[in-house]
C-alpha cells in the first residue's frame, strides 16, 4: 500500500516472522539502557544536563528528529512513511554515534555497544522494510567532514554535543519504539 493511501479491504502484503518484532523491541530497549548509562556519566562529569545554552551547540548539529510529516506519531500515523523515517534517521545517527566513541572514560565499552547495537537494529528494520522503497544512505564524504568538524570543537562544545546527541537519540528511539509496536 503506497504511503498516504488507504488499504481497501485487501489482504496484507506479507506475513511477518513471529520473532522479528520481539528482536526489534528488545534491541531498542537495550540501546536505550545503554544511552541511560552514558547520559549518567555525561551528567556526572559536567553540568551540561542542566545547561540552558544548548541552542548554541545545536546550531552546529543536524540531528535527526521526528516531525509530524514523518508519520510516526499517533496523529497522522503512516506506517510505511514512518518505517522509512526510522531507518533513515538511524543511518543519519551513525556518524554521531561514531563521534561518541572515545568521549567516555568509564563507559567506553557501553558507547561501543550502543554503536554496534544500532547497526544490528538497522539490519532488523531493513528486513522488516524489504517491500518498501529504497532508503537513502548518508554520503560517507559528508559524514567524514562532519566528524572532523565536531572533533575540532572546543571542550565545552564537545561536551554539549555529546549531551545533545544522547538526548536526541533517546527521544528518537522512544518515538520509534512507540510507533514500531503498532507495526
Amino acid at each position: 500500500v503506497p504511503p498516504g493511501e488507504d488499504s481497501k479491504d485487501v489482504a496484507a502484503p506479507h506475513r511477518q516472522p513471529l520473532t522479528s518484532s520481539e528482536r526489534i523491541d528488545k534491541q531498542i530497549r537495550y540501546i536505550l539502557d545503554g544511552i541511560s548509562a552514558l547520559r549518567k556519566e555525561t551528567c556526572n562529569k559536567s553540568n551540561m544536563c542542566e545547561s540552558s545554552k544548548e541552542a548554541l551547540a545545536e546550531n552546529n548539529l543536524n540531528l535527526p528528529k521526528m516531525a509530524e510529516k514523518d508519520g510516526c506519531f499517533q496523529s497522522g500515523f503512516n506506517e510505511e512513511t514512518c518505517l522509512v523515517k526510522i531507518i533513515t534517521g538511524l543511518l543519519e545517527f551513525e556518524v554521531y554515534l561514531e563521534y561518541l566513541q572515545n568521549r567516555f572514560e568509564s563507559s567506553e565499552e557501553q558507547a561501543r555497544a550502543v554503536q554496534m547495537s544500532t547497526k544490528v537494529l538497522i539490519q532488523f528494520l531493513q528486513k522488516k522494510a524489504k517491500n518498501l522503497d529504497a532508503i537513502t544512505t548518508p554520503d560517507p564524504t559528508t559524514n567524514a567532514s562532519l566528524l572532523t568538524k565536531l572533533q575540532a570543537q572546543n571542550q565545552w562544545l564537545q561536551d554539549m554535543t555529546t549531551h545533545l546527541i544522547l538526548r536526541s537519540f533517546k527521544e528518537f528511539l522512544q518515538s520509534s519504539l512507540r510507533a514500531l509496536r503498532q507495526m
Epitope: 502484503p13 513471529l18 520481539e22 499517533q74 500515523f77 506506517e79 510507533a179 503498532q182 507495526m183
Partner: antibody
Framework: EVQLVESGGGLVQPGGSLRLSCAAS????????MHWVRQAPGKGLEWVAK????????YYSDTVTDRFTFSLDTSKSTAYLQMNSLRAEDTAVYYC????????????WGQGTLVTVSS | DIQLTQSPSSLSASVGDRVTITCSAS?????MYWYQQKPGKAPKLLIY???NLASGVPSRFSGSGSGTDFTLTISSLQPEDFATYYC?????????FGQGTKVEIK
C-alpha cells in the same frame, strides 16, 4: 463512545468459510493495530491474529496460519477476518480488539461474535 | 510458545479481602498484562506493562513482577470484582494467556 462491533458469526460446516467484520467507531481508526482473540465455549482466551494500522504487516497464531486472513478497509474503519477451511476446534466467540497506542496491550474489545463449526 | 500458569485456578473470598493472583511464565517475558472478564462479556484491560493501571481502573488493582513471576493484587475486594482474571504476555508473537483465575464469593 469508543467501541468495536463484531458481526458475521454463525453456524458453518467443517471445511466451510466465514468472514467476520469489526466496525470501529468513536476514535480515529488509522493509527491503531487491530487484533482478533477467540474464546472456545467455557474455555480461556486465545490470541488469533494482528494487523498493523495500514495493513502492511500481519501476524497469525500457528493454529490459523494459511487458513485465516486479516484485512482492513480503513475508509470504512472496519477490520475483517476471512476464515477458510474451518474446523470444529475453531468454534469460539471471536473478539476484535484495538492495540493501545505505543504499547502491546489490547485496550478496547468488541462484544464478540459466535462462530460454530459443526455438521 | 510461552506458557503462562496462573494460580490458584479459582478462589473464594469476601468483600474487603486482599486477593493475590500469580502468573508464572515458562521463560522470561518482555511485557505482562492483566484482564478481567465477567460472564458473557468481553475482557477488560486492568494492568499493562507489568504495573501500569489502565484508564478508568480503580487503584485497588495493582500489578508487580518481572522475568517469569508476576502478581495481580486487589487490595480490598469489591462486589463488582467477582470475575475471572487472565494474565497475558507479549514477547513476540503469539501473545499467550494464562488459563484464568475465577474469583468467587465466599
Amino acid at each position: 463512545e469508543v467501541q468495536l462491533v463484531e458481526s458475521g458469526g454463525g453456524l458453518v460446516q467443517p471445511g466451510g468459510s466465514l468472514r467476520l467484520s469489526c466496525a470501529a467507531s468513536g476514535f480515529t481508526f488509522s493509527p491503531f493495530a487491530m487484533h482478533w482473540v477467540r474464546q472456545a465455549p467455557g474455555k480461556g482466551l486465545e490470541w488469533v491474529a494482528k494487523i498493523s494500522p495500514g495493513g502492511s504487516w500481519t501476524y497469525y497464531s500457528d493454529t490459523v496460519t494459511d487458513r485465516f486472513t486479516f484485512s482492513l478497509d480503513t475508509s470504512k474503519s472496519t477490520a475483517y477476518l476471512q476464515m477458510n477451511s474451518l474446523r470444529a476446534e475453531d468454534t469460539a466467540v471471536y473478539y476484535c480488539a484495538r492495540q493501545l497506542w505505543g504499547y502491546y496491550a489490547l485496550d478496547i474489545w468488541g462484544q464478540g461474535t459466535l462462530v460454530t463449526v459443526s455438521s | 510458545d510461552i506458557q503462562l500458569t496462573q494460580s490458584p485456578s479459582s478462589l473464594s473470598a469476601s468483600v474487603g479481602d486482599r486477593v493475590t493472583i500469580t502468573c508464572s511464565a515458562s521463560i522470561s517475558v518482555s511485557y505482562m498484562y492483566w484482564y478481567q472478564q465477567k460472564p458473557g462479556k468481553a475482557p477488560k484491560l486492568l494492568i499493562y506493562d507489568m504495573s501500569n493501571l489502565a484508564s478508568g481502573v480503580p487503584s485497588r488493582f495493582s500489578g508487580s513482577g518481572s522475568g517469569t513471576d508476576f502478581t495481580l493484587t486487589i487490595s480490598s475486594l469489591q462486589p463488582e470484582d467477582f470475575a475471572t482474571y487472565y494474565c497475558m504476555q507479549w514477547s513476540g508473537y503469539p501473545y499467550t494467556f494464562g488459563q484464568g483465575t475465577k474469583v468467587e464469593i465466599k
